[in-house]
């Protein structure tokens, strides 16, 4: 596939994943769809670290947009060696995106491993932290959390989504990093009639 078409495809995929991460992080702030827990210290640290919003969202949005633009037609220079400026910008922004996605993956992974902050037996805390993630396999104990209601399946679903999205973002940013580097040195393979006159 031509580097330009590849960049556009990767860029659109990254923008979609960014939106998924931002929405997932926003939902983590309202466990079970209730806003009453948002302004208190009853949400886990991993929710407040905004892995999905900052890392998987804003930090990956930059390479996403850069990749779409790099996949656009024309730039400085003409002919098959055009578009190198945008490709170079996409190289750096893809590296930045990898860092953002890794941040999102780390925070979400920790959120899954530690479990949510919840009220259990009259005490607020990270009651699932002790299990080193084993609680994920024992759903019968999820209900021991008294508040926020249904916080365990809520957190598990959304953090799992963030883990999956950030893994895909790392792969796509990596692909775009390689693709854009090729684009810088080799240019786009599109024919001259594809370039603006």
């Amino acid at each position: 596939m031509c580097t330009g078409k590849c960049a556009r495809c990767v860029g659109l995929s990254l923008i979609t994943l960014c939106l998924v991460c931002i929405v997932a992080n926003a939902l983590l702030l309202v466990p079970n769809g209730e806003t009453s827990w948002t302004n208190t210290n009853h949400l886990s640290l991993q929710v407040w670290l905004m892995g999905g919003f900052i890392g998987g969202g804003l930090m990956v949005l930059c390479p996403g947009i850069a990749a779409v633009r790099a996949g656009g037609k024309g730039c400085c220079g003409a002919g098959c060696c055009g578009n190198r400026c945008r490709m170079l910008r996409s190289v750096f922004s893809s590296a930045f995106g990898v860092l953002g996605a890794i941040y999102c993956l780390s925070v979400s992974g920790a959120g899954l491993r530690n479990g949510p902050r919840c009220l259990m037996n009259g005490e607020w805390g990270y009651h699932f932290e002790d299990t080193a993630g084993a609680y994920l396999l024992n759903r019968t104990l999820w209900d021991r959390c008294e508040a926020p209601p249904r916080v365990v399946p809520w957190n598990v679903t959304l953090f799992s989504l963030l883990v999956a999205a950030s893994c895909l973002e790392i792969v796509l940013c990596g692909i775009q990093l390689v693709n854009a580097t090729i684009g810088v040195f080799c240019g786009d393979c599109r024919k001259k009639q594809d370039t603006p006159h």
Partner: antibody, heavy 110, light 103 residues
Framework: LVKPGGSLKLSCAAS????????MSWVRQTPDKRLEWVAT????????YYPDSVKGRFTISRDNAKNTLYLQMRSLKSEDTAMYYC?????????????WGQGTTLTVSS | SLPVSLGDQASISCRSS???????????LEWYLQKPGQSPKLLIY???NRFSGVPDRFSGSGSGTDFTLKISRVEAEDLGVYYC?????????FGSGTKLEIK
Amino acid sequence: LVKPGGSLKLSCAASGFTFSSYGMSWVRQTPDKRLEWVATISSGGGYTYYPDSVKGRFTISRDNAKNTLYLQMRSLKSEDTAMYYCARHEGFTTYYFDYWGQGTTLTVSS
Amino acid sequence: SLPVSLGDQASISCRSSQSILHSSGNTYLEWYLQKPGQSPKLLIYKVSNRFSGVPDRFSGSGSGTDFTLKISRVEAEDLGVYYCFQGSHVPFTFGSGTKLEIK
């Protein structure tokens, strides 16, 4: 046999299961055969729970490397006289007691 | 105590002073049997779930504050003291116990 005001540390050695994966409790049975929950500790030892009757006097702890559960008892009273059982929870935290130890008798008397 | 004849049905009741419904919607009520000279053994958890290895002649029911353990056909090995236990709210508490004995 311990005198009132004295201290004692009970221990419960576990075997046959992955000790570090289970919440553990101490339950006592008074001479009139009533059962009373005494203390609970989560699988990693991060969370402990007590009834008001023993809070501040009893401390539950565990050593997962040694597969051992402990109950440190201080300021003992005559009403602490009982058979003390260690019991395993199904899972890492408070749920039902699926297996119980054989028990150890504590007598607090002057 | 509850005197019964072997082969008869026995019903043991447990009443709580307040609802033991957990905020998750579950009711953490358990039944334990202590035979003479032995440690208690789990029979029923979450009101009506039989623990592994417990014969199907044992069944639990109830909600809110009133719970019942039924033994459809009492056998000699069922004799002992039955305790209910609530694990929904701290402090966790046991019932005073019901002694099942031969009539």
